[in-house]
């Protein structure tokens, strides 16, 4: 642990004559620096140099060639490595006064004229005289304000808001300071911090905007942490809103975003007067270019029952926002001519849900449906086939005679989706055909009976059964069935000999 540096002259304060020169020496066990009034300035009349000596100590000399009122203030010698932005400098101090009969008060930076007080805390109105002997009074609109005065610091007290002026008289001449504006700040023991990012997904070249708002608190220090921080890419802004309540809105803007700007954006608010901290973060992603992803919640072949109500839902992830449209058999779906509707709803920032709704499914609703999502950078589509399932029904059941051969063909035409299966049944005892047990299924391998099925179109099927010879009257039943239902019809086949007898009669 190093002992504090030492200063020559070894005094707390020193009064230096106007326009004279003075020098301060600092000795330390390590490298030392000076902090002094106007040290932000490249001041031509303050010179700092290192001095060699044989004591083994580091020596730094501060020299002022022509002292002026502006040189009045605290001079601090400190070890280089101990300086931190947060803390007050630790080191050895000397206060220098340079009395000037024409300049009663040390010129201040303009921000010093804004005195911030928190709640009922005490504050300092920092009017400092160039001469420690100068009497000073403090005034506001009500007159002289009682407060304790220290020429090194100013007036210390509890002040109400408004303008305050320090007044001094030097050799019969009156001086006043620029008005100090005492401003009361609201500070709460807890930090109410809200973060907002209207967008978390961007593409290259766009501007990222993130805001953090602090409510009911004016004594706040807010820091941003974000991927482009090292490069200083962000522009920060502060807006103060007073109505209906105090709100500090901090905005971080990152123009011309690139993929490298993807990551966590964090704001950390710290109560400037208390150790209260609060942080919020949001993850931002920047894509090289826009994108679209389509996720259907159904397969590429879908069936719907006749008159059924059915919804087909497609999830879409896209940025920038997509235009979504539906096609049927490659033609734009005209909704008002059908009982089909479509809609799109935004679920999240880049998530959308589109629905195709069949209100009462009809046969003609069958077909190929395509959803198309597109933005300026991408186009994606998804096509599925829809079949309207119709219960099977028999359109026609007819017989056909083969003339002299005595053979007969029965034709059964049925429709339905899916295409119905056709089964044939036969009842040989015409008197007992009312009894189900009298009916037997025609097997395909029976000699002299041929069954065949032909598909006429997508939803119509024709079944044929050919009897080589019909020798007695029989009943034939056609049974058409699919997943949704079955229908049957019966036909009587009369033997040709019987038919001719009937004709003669």
């Amino acid at each position: 642990q190093l002992s504090l540096p030492s200063i020559l002259p070894n005094e707390n304060e020193k009064v230096v004559q106007l326009n004279s020169s003075f020098s301060l020496r600092c000795f330390g066990e390590s490298e030392v620096s000076w902090q002094y009034p106007m040290s932000e300035e490249e001041s031509s009349d303050v010179e700092i140099r290192n001095e060699e000596n044989n004591s083994g100590l580091f020596v730094t000399v501060l020299e002022v060639s022509s002292a002026s009122a502006a040189h009045t203030g605290l001079y601090t010698c400190y070890y280089n490595h101990t300086q931190t932005e947060e803390n007050e400098l630790e080191g050895r101090h000397i206060y220098i006064y340079v009395p000037d009969p024409d300049v009663a008060f040390v010129p201040l930076g303009m921000t010093d004229y804004l005195v911030i007080v928190e709640d009922d805390d005490s504050a300092i109105i920092p009017c400092r005289t160039t001469d420690p002997e100068t009497p000073v009074t403090l005034h506001n609109s009500e007159g002289v304000v009682p407060a304790s005065y220290d020429s090194r610091q100013g007036f210390n007290g509890t002040f109400t808001v408004g303008p305050y002026i320090c007044e001094a008289t030097v050799k019969g001449k009156k001086f006043q300071t620029i008005p100090f504006n005492v401003y009361a700040l609201k500070a709460t023991s807890e930090l109410d911090l809200e973060m907002e990012a209207l967008k978390t997904v961007y593409k290259s070249g766009e501007t990222i905007v993130v805001t953090c708002a602090v409510f009911n608190n004016e004594v706040v220090d807010l820091q941003w942490t974000y991927p482009g921080e090292v490069k200083g890419k962000g522009i920060t802004m502060l807006e103060e809103i007073k109505v209906p309540s105090i709100k500090l809105v901090y905005t971080l803007t990152v123009p011309e975003a690139t993929v490298k700007d993807s990551g966590d954006y964090e704001c950390a608010a710290r109560q400037a007067t208390r150790e209260v901290k609060e942080m919020k973060k949001v993850t931002i992603s920047v894509h090289e270019k826009g994108f679209i992803e389509i996720k259907p919640t159904f397969s590429q072949l879908e069936a719907v029952n006749l008159h059924e109500v059915k919804h087909f839902v497609v999830e879409v992830r896209a940025y920038p926002p997509p235009r979504i449209s539906w096609l049927k058999n490659n033609l734009t779906l005209i909704e008002n001519l059908t009982e089909i509707t479509t809609d799109v709803e935004k679920i999240q920032e880049i998530r959308y849900r589109s629905k195709l709704k069949l209100i009462r499914a009809k046969e003609e609703d069958s077909g190929h449906y395509t959803i198309v999502a597109q933005n300026e950078d991408a186009v994606k589509s998804y096509t599925f086939e829809l079949l309207t399932q119709v219960p099977s029904s028999i359109l026609d059941l007819v017989d056909d005679h083969h003339g002299s051969t005595g053979g007969q063909t029965v034709r059964c035409t049925a429709e339905g989706t899916p295409l119905p299966d056709i089964e044939w049944m036969i009842c040989k005892d015409i008197k007992k055909c009312n009894n189900e047990t009298s009916w037997t299924i025609l097997a395909n391998n029976v000699s002299n009976i041929i069954t065949e099925i032909h598909s006429r179109d997508r939803s119509t099927v024709e079944g044929r059964v050919t009897f080589a010879k019909v020798e007695e009257t029989i009943a034939v039943r056609c049974l058409a069935k699919n997943l949704l239902g079955a229908e049957n019809r019966e036909l009587k086949l009369v033997a040709p000999t019987l038919r001719s007898e009937l004709t003669v009669a």
């Epitope: 106007m38 932000e40 300035e41 001041s43 022509s66 002026s68 009122a69 502006a70 000037d100 024409d102 300049v103 009663a104 008060f105 010129p107 201040l108 930076g109 303009m110 921000t111 004229y113 005034h139 506001n140 609109s141 009500e142 007159g143 303008p163 002026i165 007044e167 009156k174 001086f175 006043q176 300071t177 620029i178 008005p179 504006n181």
Partner: antibody, heavy 117, light 107 residues
Framework: QVQLVQSGAEVKKPGASVKVSCKAS????????MYWVRQAPGQGLEWMGI????????SYAQKFQGRVTMTRDTSTSTVYMELSSLRSEDTAVYYC??????????WGQGTLVTVSS | DIQMTQSPSSLSASVGDRVTITCRAS??????LNWYQQKPGKAPKLLVY???SLQSGVPSRFSGSGSGTDFTLTISSLQPEDFATYYC?????????FGGGTKVEIK
């Protein structure tokens, strides 16, 4: 003796900027504030702002905020006042004035700025 | 902002007259009121500061008084060189503001 010498008259077009200089001598430049005051033809005086030459900090009247910039060069003991986006109503005599208090014991001779298309 | 109102806006007087110009502030400004004299084509000149202090080199016929909101500049015996325009200025609060001026003319 204290002297404030300002730059010469200027004629500017609307939308342009003007930069007026004020060179101080005869006193310690960094010990006194410099103020800028303007006076339109036949009108009264209007305070524009202040600069502390020691450090360069400034405070501007709300009316000029965003349009006025006050700077200084300590090596030449000169302060500058730049007014941008000029309009015809900015036609005025612009004065720099010194003061350790917010009243002005020494004034420059004034610089007439005429804004005309 | 504090508004400063001067009256009269102009007056005619003769050499040797006692002349009084008043200045009223829109709110209390304690005694932080200053007076300037301006002659045509010239820069203003500080006469009186903090209500009643006479700037060095200013003749003693000029005096200032008042506090709160009402202030007065008095010229006890008007001289030929005093025909000019006089302005008051408050230094109590930022922005610093001036009165509209009082023109003193020869009768």
């Amino acid at each position: 003796q204290v002297q404030l010498v300002q730059s010469g008259a200027e004629v500017k077009k609307p939308g342009a900027s003007v930069k007026v200089s004020c060179k101080a001598s005869g006193y310690t430049f960094t010990s006194y504030y410099m103020y800028w005051v303007r006076q339109a033809p036949g009108q009264g005086l209007e305070w524009m702002g202040i600069i502390n030459p020691s450090g360069g900090s400034t405070s501007y009247a709300q009316k000029f905020q965003g349009r006025v910039t006050m700077t200084r060069d300590t090596s030449t003991s000169t302060v500058y006042m730049e007014l941008s986006s000029l309009r015809s109503e900015d036609t005025a005599v612009y004065y720099c004035a010194r003061g350790s208090s917010p009243f002005f014991d020494y004034w420059g001779q004034g610089t007439l700025v005429t804004v005309s298309s | 902002d504090i508004q400063m109102t001067q009256s009269p806006s102009s007056l005619s007087a003769s050499v040797g007259d006692r002349v009084t110009i008043t200045c009223r502030a829109s709110q209390i400004i304690s005694h932080f009121l200053n007076w300037y004299q301006q002659k045509p084509g010239k820069a203003p000149k500080l006469l009186v500061y903090v209500a009643s202090s006479l700037q060095s080199g200013v003749p003693s016929r000029f005096s200032g008084s008042g506090s709160g909101t009402d202030f007065t500049l008095t010229i006890s015996s008007l001289q030929p060189e005093d025909f000019a325009t006089y302005y008051c200025q408050q230094s109590f609060s930022i922005p610093l503001t001036f009165g509209g001026g009082t023109k003193v003319e020869i009768k």
